[in-house]
């Protein structure tokens, strides 16, 4: 029975005489008068078995002690650690010619674990062992036994096991402990690759190449390799593994992303929080599920927020010019969180008696610049039929519109084509300008071409460049535009509408709001 003693992780003990409970029972030659098994107390008052010999008075000593058979366990090189005490010959009277201060260490490889006799000629010498510290009679009196530790190695070994032997040639010696071990590079994980226990090579300079295996939930990026050095240390890690999608490195292993996190690819990145408007309900998510009403386009990365279709375009205005219609609108209030917004135009030809009976306009109608995928907020439609009701729908679309098409994404206008809409208004004037308002007035168009039903004023801040405009409608030839910002340049356009539709807008009138009230007359082009 052996008791366990703690040694370095890179050493595997094959024999430890101090761990043996009871007699060691090694073979001595001669059987008597040479090596003798003696029980002594160690530094912790634990009994340990030792072998002693002290035939220093007699010449030509040749006392052999052989261990039991020691299994090799696949090791090619083993290490022998001997702890011993040795008496100083100078401290012994009358032994000058016969006392020695060394002993010899031998080994013999064998597949036979039950060899009963010592055959000296079978053994190969490892080394002569000398003491760094020898002790005298004074040391014995003081109970100071000077313990020597010597380590030798032997290899390459090839048979199943071996025997060790100690040859005494006339020393006063006590073998306190004998430990035989080999070195291994212990199981380790590096770069998410596991490297197994690996026995070191046959010679003291050899490196054993070992291929690692990726830990659970990981895959090879480059082949993971390490070298096991002769001292039992791992050297030169090469290559690595990466945690699979849905997993991240944590304490040398690949663990599933937590709920609410995801990882789309096998990379060395950590899991990321689900992007806006998405979630994950399981551990180990490789992508996150979009919230209800939100979507991902086919080419959207997993890291992109989920988005939704845009709302309808705003402020759709039409301008009928005989059998042509110009449509203009503003961007939707909500783009759905995407930049890839475009517009499609749907044209329907409707019966005069029953506006609900509408049919597609057909291929004879032409759109400038195009009917679908418009990037601008205006379109010109030509080659319509005269005196016909048309309904035009402007659809705002983005990369996810196809997943949830809804009428909420369009705005429509119904017009009647004619032979002549009113001409444009020649003169627009700013009658009064205050901090927050502008009073406008204008003349009737030169050619009304019918009864003027109303006027439409379009205005916007000059530096907004017509991107964000407002519309005011009035039956009179003047209006007060309120709610403006002080000291801000505004651009105004006015047009007239008859039953035939809208005329063209007037030339722009630019007005800057004041800090103090003033009464001025504009000239239709510029006013300050």
């Amino acid at each position: 029975v052996t008791g366990s003693r703690v040694y370095p992780a890179n050493e595997v003990t094959l024999l430890d005489s101090r761990s043996v409970q009871g007699e060691l029972g090694w073979i001595a030659s001669p059987l008597e008068g040479g090596w003798e098994e003696v029980s002594i107390m160690d530094e912790k008052n634990t009994p340990i078995r030792t072998y002693q010999v002290c035939n220093v008075m007699e010449p030509s000593q040749n006392n052999w002690l052989r261990t039991d058979w020691i299994t090799r366990e696949g090791a090619q090189r083993v290490y022998i650690e001997i702890k011993f005490t040795l008496r100083d010959c100078n401290s012994l009277p009358g032994v000058m010619g016969t006392c020695k201060e060394t002993f010899n260490l031998y080994y013999y490889e064998s597949d036979n674990d039950k060899e009963r006799f010592i055959r000296e000629n079978q053994f190969v010498k490892i080394d002569t062992i000398a003491a760094d510290e020898s002790f005298t009679q004074v040391d014995i009196g003081d109970r100071i036994m000077k313990l020597n530790t010597e380590i030798r190695d032997v290899g390459p070994l090839s048979k199943k096991g071996f025997y060790l032997a100690f040859q005494d040639v006339g020393a006063c010696i006590a073998l306190v402990s004998v430990r035989v071990f080999y070195k291994k590079c212990p199981l380790t994980v590096r770069n998410l690759a596991q490297f197994p226990d690996t026995i070191t090579g046959a010679d003291t300079s050899s490196l054993v190449e070992v291929r690692g295996s990726c830990v659970n939930n990981s895959e090879e990026k480059d082949v993971p390799k390490m070298y096991c050095g002769a001292d039992g240390e791992w050297l030169v890690p090469i290559g690595n593994c990466l945690c699979n999608a849905g997993h991240e490195e944590r304490s040398g292993e690949c663990q599933a992303c937590k709920i609410g996190y995801y990882k789309a690819l096998s990379t060395d990145a950590t899991c990321a929080k689900c992007p806006p408007h998405s979630y994950s309900v399981w551990e180990g998510a490789t992508s996150c599920t979009c919230d209800r009403g939100f979507f991902r386009a086919d080419n959207d990365a997993a890291s992109m927020p989920c988005t939704r279709p845009p709302s309808a375009p705003l402020n759709l205005i039409s301008n009928v010019n005989e059998t042509s219609v110009n449509l203009e609108w503003s961007s939707p209030q909500n783009t759905g969180g995407r930049q890839d917004i475009s517009y499609n135009v749907v044209c329907k030809k409707c019966g005069a008696g029953d506006p609900s009976k509408c049919r597609p306009c057909g291929s004879g109608v032409h759109y400038t610049p195009q009917q679908n995928g418009l990037k601008t907020t205006k379109v010109s439609i030509t080659d319509l039929l005269a005196h016909t009701n048309y309904t035009f729908e402007i659809w705002a679309v983005n990369g996810v519109s196809k997943y949830n098409p809804s009428p909420d994404q369009s705005v429509s206008v119904t017009v009647t084509t004619n032979q002549a809409a009113p001409s444009s208004i020649a003169l627009v004037q700013a009658k009064e300008v205050t901090r927050y308002s502008v009073a406008l007035a204008w003349l009737e168009p030169d050619r009304p071409n019918g009864v003027i039903l109303e006027y439409e004023v379009k205005y916007y801040e000059k530096d907004q460049n017509e991107r964000s405009y407002r519309i005011v409608r009035t039956a009179a030839r003047n209006t007060d535009i309120k709610g403006l910002n002080p000291l801000t340049s505004y651009v105004f356009h006015v047009r007239a509408r008859t039953a035939a539709g809208y005329g063209d807008f007037s030339e722009p009138l630019e007005v800057t709001t004041n800090t103090v009230p003033s009464r001025i007359i504009g000239d239709g082009a510029n006013s300050t």
Epitope: N216, R250, K258
Partner: antibody
Framework: QSLEESGGRLVTPGTPLTLTCTVS????????MSWVRQAPGKGLEWIGI?????NTYYANWAKGRFTISKTSTTVDLKITSPTTEDTATYFC????????????WGPGTLVTVSS | YVMMTQTPSSVSAAVGGTVTINCQAS????????LAWYQQKPGQRPKLLIY???TLASGVPSRFKGSGSGTEFTLTISDLECADAATYYC?????????FGGGTKVEIK
Amino acid sequence: QSLEESGGRLVTPGTPLTLTCTVSGFSLSSYHMSWVRQAPGKGLEWIGIIYRSGNTYYANWAKGRFTISKTSTTVDLKITSPTTEDTATYFCARESSTFYGMDLWGPGTLVTVSS
Amino acid sequence: YVMMTQTPSSVSAAVGGTVTINCQASQSVYGNNELAWYQQKPGQRPKLLIYRASTLASGVPSRFKGSGSGTEFTLTISDLECADAATYYCLGYKSDDYTFGGGTKVEIK
């Protein structure tokens, strides 16, 4: 779902002590488990964690002083060589699968180290 | 390894009042929001209040509010009740390590 620590007692310095956390209502193969301690009148201190896989990880200050292991229904904390500074209430706690933190705690067990 | 600095170490407030506890991390916590708040009363186990910096744990009254991101986090307790007298701890996670703040003892006057 509950946790119950046991094994806390008075020990002399240097005498190894093992605390046990018994789990019920969930599987240790699905959750990571941590140990946390609290010295009398002091704050909470995270010791270490045993992952579902059985691998362990310790706070820097705890390395070599504690060993965490588990069976199918228990998680053990071994205090390898207790000192008087290890006198504390020891809690085992379950790491959430939803967030990084502990969502279920045991009532704790008191360890007193004194000569 | 992340260090969590909690302030103040103690605070006293009246019933119906509001208490604010701060927790500062020495570096950004994992995901910028992996921070939890716990309440502990004498002789009892810690109780989870808030996780992921701002999500209220099940059964916790909405008087408890967590906020913050990265390195700065706050726990606010409004409409204080006598039952809120306890010590409150933040817990941060980063690079395999958990760290508790030093704790804030809340007394109710």
